[in-house]
C-alpha cells in the first residue's frame, strides 16, 4: 500500500527531516509549512495548526520560502550617484548599481556600497585600462610618438600626426603641428575611445607605468583638482 | 581628519622578512590610491610601491622589485607592504601615503606619521 | 628613468629673504611636479602640486613655476617656520623620484 501523505502539521518520523518548504518547529516539535516569497509567518505552528503566513508590508520583502515573524526591510533609496536596478517588491530587495561615468568602489552582498567617479585622465595621460562597473580607469604617460590633449575617462593616447614638414613637434599632449600643407597621414579627427576593458591583473612598472586613481569627495580633499570624487553610499 | 597610521616596523636580521600595515581613516579608503615612500637615516625620499584604489595595478622601484610585494584590503581599510629578503640598504623610516591619484591627481598629499626598518645582524 | 637634479642641496638664508630652489628633470614631465617641505623628524608635506598649484593651507609666500625640464620653487620672504629641506618629485614614468633636496639653512 502507498505510504500515507502527511498533512501540516504532523510528527516527523524519528531521524527523519520535514519535507521540502516545510520545516521543524522546535517548540510544537513539528513539521509545519514554510511561508512562500513575500510572505513571512504571521503565527507558528502548534501541535493542531499549522504556520499562518501573512503578505509582507510596503518596502519589506521576503525572497525564499521562510518562517521569520517579520519581513526584511528594502535597502534606502538610491543615492544620486547610482540608478535601481531592481525595485523592491514584496519578493526582492531593491539593487542601486553605480550610474554612467561611475564605478562601484565598494560593493556589498547586491548593488553597491560605495560609488564613486571614474578617473579622468589629464593631458599627457591615456586610458590604459577602461573602467568598469567594479573598477577603475588606469592611465598612463603617453608614449613618445602619441599623446593626448583631454581630460577624459575613455580617451586613449593617440599617434601624432606626420607632417611633411613639422611646423611644431607633437608632445605627449599635443599633436605635432604641420605647416600649411596638409599631413602626409593624420589620425581620424576627434577622440579615439577605448572599447570595453580587459580584466587582467597588471603589476607594471616601467617604462610606461598603468597606474590607477581613486574617485574624489570634495569635502575631503586638501587641495582644489583633487584626485578622486568619493559617491554616496547605497544603504 | 585623514589619518595613516604605520605600524609592523623594527629590527630584521639580513634576508628576513617583515610586514608592515597602514590603517587608514578619514577618507573614503577604496578610491584613493596609495604607495610606501621610504627615507634612509639622514638620507632623502625614495618612492618604493604603489597600488591603485582596487588593488589592480601596481608599481614597484626596481630597488624592491621582486622582494617587496604591496597590498590592500578595501574591507579593512589598510594597506600592507611585505618585505622578503631584506637587506642593510633597507633600512629607512617607511612612510604610508595617499595618493598619487596617478594620471589625475599626481601627488602625494597625506603622509603617515612613518615606521622604522632596521636591517642588521 | 628620470634623473632628478635639485640645487642648491643647502642654502643659508636670513628672515624676510627671497629663496629659489631649481629642480631639472632629464626630460620633460609635463608639469607633473609637487614640492614637499619636510622638519626634522616629521613627516614631509605637500607645498606645491602641478608644478605651480598651491596646496591648501599653504601660505601664498610659496609658489612654484616652471614646465617641460625646469621646475623653481620661491619662498618670496622666508619665516622663521620655514627652516627646513624641501623636495621635488616627478610623476611622468614611474619610479617616481624624487630630488635629493635643499636644506634651507638659518644664517
Known amino acids: 500500500l502507498p505510504a500515507q501523505v502527511a498533512f501540516t502539521p504532523y510528527a516527523p518520523e524519528p531521524g527523519s527531516t520535514c519535507r521540502l518548504r516545510e520545516y521543524y518547529d522546535q517548540t510544537a516539535q513539528m513539521c509545519c509549512s514554510k511561508c512562500s516569497p513575500g510572505q513571512h509567518a504571521k503565527v507558528f505552528c502548534t501541535k493542531t495548526s499549522d504556520t499562518v503566513c501573512d503578505s509582507c508590508e510596503d518596502s519589506t520583502y521576503t525572497q525564499l520560502w521562510n518562517w521569520v515573524p517579520e519581513c526584511l526591510s528594502c535597502g534606502s533609496r538610491c543615492s544620486s550617484d547610482q540608478v535601481e536596478t531592481q525595485a523592491c517588491t514584496r519578493e526582492q530587495n531593491r539593487i542601486c548599481t553605480c550610474r554612467p561615468g561611475w564605478y562601484c568602489a565598494l560593493s556589498k552582498q547586491e548593488g553597491c556600497r560605495l560609488c564613486a567617479p571614474l578617473r579622468k585622465c589629464r593631458p599627457g595621460f591615456g586610458v590604459a585600462r577602461p573602467g568598469t562597473e567594479t573598477s577603475d580607469v588606469v592611465c598612463k604617460p603617453c608614449a613618445p610618438g602619441t599623446f593626448s590633449n583631454t581630460t577624459s575617462s575613455t580617451d586613449i593616447c593617440r599617434p601624432h600626426q606626420i607632417c611633411n614638414v613639422v611646423a611644431i613637434p607633437g608632445n605627449a599632449s599635443m599633436d605635432a603641428v604641420c605647416t600649411s600643407t596638409s599631413p602626409t597621414r593624420s589620425m581620424a579627427p576627434g577622440a579615439v575611445h577605448l572599447p570595453q576593458p580587459v580584466s587582467t591583473r597588471s603589476q607594471h612598472t616601467q617604462p610606461t607605468p598603468e597606474p590607477s586613481t581613486a574617485p574624489s569627495t570634495s569635502f575631503l580633499l586638501p587641495m582644489g583638482p583633487s584626485p578622486p570624487a568619493e559617491g554616496s553610499t547605497g544603504d | 581628519e585623514v589619518q595613516l597610521v604605520e605600524s609592523g616596523g623594527g629590527l630584521v636580521q639580513p634576508g628576513g622578512s617583515l610586514r608592515l600595515s597602514c590603517a587608514a581613516s578619514?577618507?573614503?579608503?577604496?578610491?584613493?590610491?596609495l604607495s610606501w615612500v621610504r627615507q634612509a637615516p639622514g638620507k632623502g625620499l625614495e618612492w618604493v610601491a604603489y597600488?591603485?584604489?582596487?588593488?589592480?595595478?601596481?608599481y614597484y622601484s626596481d630597488t624592491v622589485k621582486g622582494r617587496f610585494t604591496i597590498s590592500r584590503d578595501n574591507a579593512k581599510n589598510t594597506l600592507y607592504l611585505q618585505m622578503n629578503s631584506l637587506r642593510a640598504e633597507d633600512t629607512a623610516v617607511y612612510y604610508c601615503?595617499?595618493?598619487?591619484?596617478?594620471?589625475?591627481?599626481?601627488?602625494?598629499?597625506?603622509w603617515g606619521q612613518g615606521t622604522l626598518v632596521t636591517v642588521s645582524s | 628613468d628620470i634623473q632628478m637634479t635639485q640645487s642648491p642641496s643647502s642654502l643659508s638664508a636670513s628672515v624676510g629673504d627671497r629663496v629659489t630652489i631649481t629642480c631639472r628633470t632629464s626630460?620633460?614631465?609635463?608639469?607633473?611636479l609637487p614640492w614637499y617641505q619636510q622638519k626634522p623628524g616629521k613627516s614631509p608635506k605637500l607645498l606645491v602640486y602641478d608644478a605651480t598649484k598651491l596646496a591648501e593651507g599653504v601660505p601664498s609666500r610659496f609658489s612654484g613655476s616652471g614646465s617641460g625640464t625646469d621646475y623653481t620653487l620661491t619662498i618670496s620672504s622666508l619665516q622663521p617656520e620655514d627652516f627646513a629641506t624641501y623636495y621635488c618629485q616627478h610623476f611622468w614614468v614611474t619610479p617616481w623620484t624624487f630630488g635629493q633636496g635643499t636644506k634651507v639653512e638659518i644664517k
Open positions: 601615503v595617499r595618493g598619487p591619484f596617478y594620471g589625475s591627481a599626481n601627488y602625494f598629499d597625506y
Open positions: 626630460e620633460s614631465i609635463y608639469s607633473n
Open positions: 578619514g577618507f573614503a579608503f577604496s578610491t584613493y590610491d
Open positions: 597600488i591603485n584604489n582596487g588593488g589592480i595595478s601596481t
